[in-house]
């Protein structure tokens, strides 16, 4: 089959599928298209995954290119690293495979770049402008399990026709992801429809066993059942519905309980009434009627705008006083006509700006030039795992300067709507002291960290404390805390506790694997834990500090005014890199776990840029651990940590990741 035919095609294994979409799209458009189907741009990190991509793409024309999920921000070259400073759209830089078309060449990397795969030959990786609409894109879909393709039977009229959850229809699959449908036509004129479902004994399998084209019972017309047909011991047939549906009064068809539900915005099947209602980004359930949604006033959040804030239904906007103009981040204000100030542009332009040369910015800001961002994907941890945050922070400043931490992007406009999926919407509010320990390289001892001063109203951008956006799923109803509030005694101004409030986003299906954003912070190691989540709950985990894909509808606002707290040492195993191109391999380094008590700040060994590789070092079964790269020699490690009552909760190791630039007034990051 010609992959450049009009129709998309896919190749699936037992746990993931790659799909080729021959549609001309920019990188951002391609990324969104994959996300809307519940996947991501392809991230072929191993030779085995690359092999599957190769077989899917086949021998296409040399003139055609396909986006894969690699992107690099302006001025973020790291030519000695396997991914050269590029970051997967899942947020990390972990890889055991590269296929660059050319050896790395020195250069300033003045602009944002994205990676496309050649459709011909070796399917080499080429970098180029993210705003170019190339010929197509490769998506990747992960899932909990897959059903093997059905064996052809003697009575079949033709091969089974499969429809995947990401809407690809084909007869060519070897594996079918959980949720796929198989339609089998029999020569006798009847047919059968099967669903790849979870099995009671565990794993997934087809909703019925063969033979499909013989006998009676469920065989003719699926026993008249819309979804599943069950042949009882006495020979009669009963019908069942797949999860999220209920059997209608006729005992055969299945109905969606949300179809007639009185939800104003979003509905999820399940619960005592058969459904529950939820609200979109910028709204919350009305207290008097949970079916209705009322606007959230984001302007009540301290520091959401530098000067003026106007709330409106579903969002807000920042404004500046006369003589000032709104900066590109949509939050900060600068004197009118000041270098670097930029009028608001078309949103599409802002999302994928190819990088400007802003040479008047001071070095520390330019080195960071990132925003606090929400993590977009569906990130599930093991049930014992508390939520993890990573705070991007780069304390590489001149001696006489205080750290500069940028404001984030407000989450506006609302992200692309996703299919209806489980969504819970309580608010967790915790007031705890955040303590900061930064060990500056020039200090005589790791035990004498500087204190980052507290913020004051109307500070300059150089001295602003971040507002950090993040996302969490709600707890199951049995664990919903409503509002938790933990107060602590008053402290001096330099030790103000942070306000952490979380809104819980709409989730995608829980079968997606964790994705971590680009938290590249040049030598800064940061970890934050949120207390109070029951140890048997599996929360969504969001890592902060990257330019990343959208899709995480709600935001956590973390206002940090710091006191001191220890570094959390972690073990970081190294990863070998396979490369098809003549790139000299990076040396591997393994950082041993510190043996000191966690209460003492610990400096990890200084690593130079020439001897690093991208380790995959999960501390928990589903967590990635991107290690922070270093662009300018040793710099301090910073840990932000909120102690957790759950004794099983270990801090997540941070490994290699990439520093991102920020987009404007939007929660959709790449």
């Amino acid at each position: 089959q010609d992959p450049w035919a009009a129709e998309p095609r896919a190749a699936c294994g037992p746990s993931s599928c790659y799909a080729l979409f021959p549609r001309r799209r920019t990188f951002l458009e391609a990324w969104r298209a994959c996300r809307e189907l519940g996947g991501d741009l392809a991230t072929p990190r191993t030779p085995e995954e690359a092999q599957r991509v190769d077989s899917l793409v086949g021998a296409g024309p040399a003139s055609r290119l396909l986006w894969i999920g690699l992107q690099r921000q302006a001025r973020q070259c790291q030519l000695q690293r396997p991914l050269r400073g590029f970051t997967w759209t899942t947020g990390d830089q972990d890889t055991a495979f590269t296929n660059w078309a050319q050896p790395a060449s020195g250069g300033p990397c003045p602009a944002q770049r994205c990676v496309a795969l050649e459709a011909s030959g070796e399917h080499r990786w080429l970098e180029g402008s993210c705003t170019l609409a190339v010929d197509g894109y490769l998506c990747q879909f992960g899932f909990e399990g897959a059903c093997p393709a059905l064996q052809d039977e003697a009575g079949q009229a033709g091969p089974a026709v499969y429809t995947t959850p990401f809407h690809l229809v084909s007869t060519e699959f070897e594996w079918l992801p959980f949720g796929s449908v198989a339609a089998v036509q029999c020569q006798a004129g009847r047919g059968a429809s099967l669903l790849c479902v979870k099995q009671p004994e565990g794993g997934v399998g087809w909703s019925r066993a063969g033979p499909l084209c013989l006998g009676t019972g469920c065989s003719p017309d699926n026993g008249g059942c819309e979804h599943e047909c069950v042949e009882e011991v006495d020979g009669h047939v009963s019908c069942r519905c797949t999860e999220g549906f209920r059997l209608a009064a006729d005992g055969r068809s299945c109905e969606d309980p949300c179809a007639q539900a009185p939800c104003e915005q979003q509905c999820e099947p399940g619960g005592p009434q058969g459904y529950s209602c939820h609200c979109r980004l910028g709204f919350r359930p009305a207290e008097d009627d949970p079916h209705r949604c009322v606007d959230t006033d984001e302007c009540q959040i301290a520091g959401v705008c530098q000067q003026m804030c106007v709330n409106y239904v579903g969002g807000f906007e920042c404004y500046c006083s006369e003589g000032h103009e709104l900066e590109a981040d949509g939050i900060s204000c600068s004197p009118a006509g000041a270098m670097g100030a930029q009028a608001s542009q078309d949103l599409g332009d802002e999302l994928l700006d190819d990088g400007e040369d802003e040479e008047d910015e001071d070095e520390a800001w330019k080195a960071f030039n990132g925003g606090w961002t929400e993590m977009p994907g569906i990130l599930w941890m093991e049930p014992t795992q508390p939520p993890d945050f990573a705070l991007a922070y780069r304390p590489s400043f001149p001696e006489d300067r205080e750290p500069q931490i940028p404001y984030p992007e407000p989450t506006w406009p609302p992200p692309l709507s996703a299919p209806r999926v489980p969504y819970h919407s309580s608010v967790l509010s915790v007031t705890r002291p955040v303590v900061v320990s930064a060990t500056h390289p020039t200090l005589p001892s790791a035990h004498q960290p500087p204190v980052i001063p507290a913020t004051h109203p109307a500070l300059s951008r150089d001295h602003q404390i971040p507002v950090i956006a993040a996302n969490y799923p709600d707890l199951p109803s049995a664990y919903q805390p409503g509002i938790l509030s933990v107060s602590h005694s008053a402290q001096p101004p330099a030790h103000q506790p942070p306000m952490i409030s979380t809104k819980y986003p709409e989730l995608f299906p829980a079968h997606q694997s964790p994705m971590f954003p680009d938290t590249r912070v040049a030598g800064t190691q940061t970890t934050t834990h949120l207390p109070g989540i029951p140890p048997n709950h599996a929360p969504l985990v969001t890592t902060l500090g990257a330019q990343l894909p959208p899709q995480a509808p709600d935001a956590l606002v973390l206002r940090t005014q710091a006191t001191q707290l220890p570094i959390i040492p972690t073990a970081q195993p190294s990863l070998t890199t396979t490369s098809r191109s003549p790139v000299s391999p990076a040396h591997q380094i393994s950082v041993p776990a510190a043996t000191q008590p966690a209460a003492l700040p610990t400096l990890l060994p200084s690593q130079s840029p020439t001897n690093q590789t991208s380790p995959i070092s999960p501390t928990h079964p589903h967590s990635k651990a991107p290690q922070i790269p270093r662009e300018d020699g040793p710099s301090p490690k910073l840990a932000l940590w909120l102690p957790s009552p759950a004794p099983t909760a270990a801090p997540t190791a941070l490994g290699e990741a990439g520093l991102a630039e920020h987009s404007q007034r939007d929660d959709r990051w790449l």
Epitope: W4, R24, P61, A62, S63, R64, L65, W100, A101, Q102, S105, P110, A111, Q112, A116, E118, S120, L126, E127, G128, S129, C130, T131, L132, A133, V134, Q345, D346, G348, D349, L352, D353, D354, G355
Partner: antibody
Framework: QVQLVQSGAEVKKPGASVKLSCKAS????????IHWVRQTPGQRLEWMGY????????TYNQKFKGRVTITGDTSANTAYMELNSLTSEDTAVYYC?????????????????WGQGTLVTVSS | DIQLTQSPSFLSASVGDRVTITCRAS??????VAWYQQKPGKAPKLLIY???NRYTGVPSRFSGSGSGTEFTLTISSLQSEDLATYYC??????????FGQGTKLEIK
């Protein structure tokens, strides 16, 4: 070496059609897209459309409202551009140009090789 | 459609001079911009692609910069053979290419 050689100058009357050719050599014809660009007497360059000889995929500039047709003959390594319903405004030099695929590990859609151009004069 | 505006339209400079030509786009085109040199009676030749990358065989005195909406072609030390008209081109909404109106460079 890569070469694009275009057919000779044409003089046409208003309302007539013209079909220009562009013969490629020095590379695999089906590996690269061919674009047609014209340059009016005012020196303005104007993109007209392209063909991908691999599968005859074509796209045209809406300005030419169905007056332009680009075709390819892979056996002759030649691309053709036909323009109908000519008017004096169509008097121009017509270029074929190859779209690059990648340079030194970068992908890019600039035009790396151009034909020498064909002057088409439309006059009554 | 995306419009490209070059300035100046006409430029006269001496051998050895540093020459700068600007191209402004009506909307963000990222780095999907190329610069071409067209000598009298000849076809255009590619100089710079992707805003700042020098094409193979192009002398190092030619350089490009910019992203978004503002782009610059610089000739660091003008040579007599640089007499030509220079065009910028955007292709961010490929395949709909658009060109600037051109800058005619004359040697004093």
């Amino acid at each position: 070496q890569v070469q694009l050689v275009q057919s000779g100058a044409e003089v046409k009357k208003p309302g007539a059609s013209v079909k220009l050719s562009c013969k490629a050599s020095g590379y695999t014809f089906t590996d690269y897209v061919i674009h047609w660009v014209r340059q009016t007497p005012g020196q303005r360059l104007e993109w007209m459309g392209y063909i991908n000889p691999y599968d005859d995929d074509t796209t045209y500039n809406q300005k030419f409202k169905g007056r332009v047709t680009i075709t390819g003959d892979t056996s002759a390594n030649t691309a053709y551009m036909e323009l109908n319903s000519l008017t004096s405004e169509d008097t121009a030099v017509y270029y074929c140009a190859r779209r690059g695929n990648s340079y030194d590990g970068y992908f890019d859609y600039s035009m790396d090789y151009w034909g020498q151009g064909t002057l088409v004069t439309v006059s009554s | 459609d995306i419009q490209l505006t070059q300035s100046p339209s006409f430029l006269s400079a001496s051998v050895g001079d540093r020459v700068t030509i600007t191209c402004r786009a009506s909307q963000n085109v990222g780095t999907a911009v190329a610069w071409y040199q067209q000598k009298p009676g000849k076809a255009p030749k590619l100089l710079i692609y992707s805003a700042s990358n020098r094409y193979t065989g192009v002398p190092s005195r030619f350089s490009g910069s910019g992203s978004g909406t503002e782009f610059t072609l610089t000739i660091s030390s003008l040579q007599s053979e640089d007499l030509a008209t220079y065009y910028c081109q955007q292709y961010t909404n490929y395949p709909m290419y658009t060109f600037g109106q051109g800058t005619k460079l004359e040697i004093k």
